[in-house]
């Protein structure tokens, strides 16, 4: 069998809502993956599991099942959404994300995704990790790759 390539493209959009009483931020983050099947037979994308971390704390998880079948030598772009919650114990985050005197409220999040593919009863898992900027202060749509955080060694806000 030839390889199945998974490429994390980036954040597509982030939609924000708040709970004022709980000082909690809800971020629905939609990410984009490119999955390429380099084989001469079809493969099934069985599931995608994803999680989002802020400062080593997991703030959101998602799992998609029975997603799609990718034909021989074909590529599919898949969007998946991870609902995240930045809760009361991080109230300094609420303060920053709701600061109205500044326009962009970028935080650095670590996106982790694992794609499970199957073919002829055989399962394969491919994982990716990327740091991404996300604006926690307003609804934002990104051009693909625009949210990339390049300094992966020392993520600072």
């Amino acid at each position: 069998p030839r390889s199945i390539d998974v490429k994390y493209i980036g954040v597509k959009s982030a939609y924000v809502s708040y709970d004022v009483q709980k000082r909690t931020i809800y971020l629905n983050i939609t990410n984009t993956l490119n999955i390429t099947n380099n084989n001469y037979y079809s493969v099934e994308v069985e599931n995608i599991t994803a999680q989002v971390q802020f400062s080593k704390t997991v703030i959101g998880k998602a799992r998609l099942n029975n997603i799609t079948i990718i034909g021989p030598l074909d590529m599919k772009q898949i969007d998946y959404t991870v609902p995240t919650v930045i809760a009361e114990e991080m109230s300094y985050m609420y303060d920053f994300c709701t600061l109205i005197s500044i326009k962009v409220h970028n935080i650095v999040l670590m996106m982790q995704v694992t794609v499970t593919t199957t073919y002829f009863g055989h399962s394969e898992q491919i994982s990716q990790e990327r740091y991404q900027y996300v604006d926690c202060g307003r609804n934002t749509t990104y051009q693909l790759g625009q949210s990339e955080y390049l300094n992966v060694l020392q993520p600072q806000q």
């Epitope: 920053f96 709701t98 005197s101 500044i102 962009v104």
Partner: antibody, heavy 120, light 112 residues
Framework: DVQLQQSGAELVRPGASVKLSCTAS????????MYWVKQRPEQGLEWIGR????????ENAPKFRGMATMTADTSSNTAYLQLNSLTSEDTAVYYC?????????????WGHGTSVTVSS | DVLMTQTPLSLPVSLGDQASISCRSS???????????LEWYLQKPGQAPKLLID???NRFSGVPDRFSGSGSGTDFTLKISRVEAEDLGVYYC?????????FGSGTKLEIK
Amino acid sequence: DVQLQQSGAELVRPGASVKLSCTASGFNIKDYYMYWVKQRPEQGLEWIGRIDPEDGDTENAPKFRGMATMTADTSSNTAYLQLNSLTSEDTAVYYCTTRIGNLYHVMDYWGHGTSVTVSS
Amino acid sequence: DVLMTQTPLSLPVSLGDQASISCRSSQSIVHSNGNTYLEWYLQKPGQAPKLLIDKVFNRFSGVPDRFSGSGSGTDFTLKISRVEAEDLGVYYCFQGSHVPFTFGSGTKLEIK
């Protein structure tokens, strides 16, 4: 190093217009709001308004609507304030200001101010 | 517009004294997101204003801890525990919760 460099002092006739500039260095203005504040001699501070340089969206104090127009040019990283139909009441120092922040640190930056004198 | 009323207009103090400046807004300046964007600035002669305190009580970067802010709703106070010569100037409160944002009329802190 973040700086807001404002244009030089202006002496203008009543009824005339003037366009003040505020050129930013050390950051990209399209990612930040730019604010304008007026201060008449020996008087307090008045908030004129703010602009989002990325899309030109503005919010003005009602008092300044029609007479103060905020614009921005992201290619030159400059915000502008145009003052129209000037009267002696518009003799003042005009400041541009912005606030730049991240999760751990927020900074408030002001230009040195542009003095506008309206006199015949 | 939200009217910000500062008292007193002038505050003569001796160095080392405590100073207290009051600011009252004509309506609540609690933003819909739950935060209160009440700020205090100090302006020295010939200079641009400098931000001392934001969101009622958060001391800004580099501001000495002798400055403290308090209050809620419509009533706010700036206290300077021991006035130093470098603290002299005009203090302004400012609300950034409701457009148009507005400044108070200013309080001049001067030597008695």
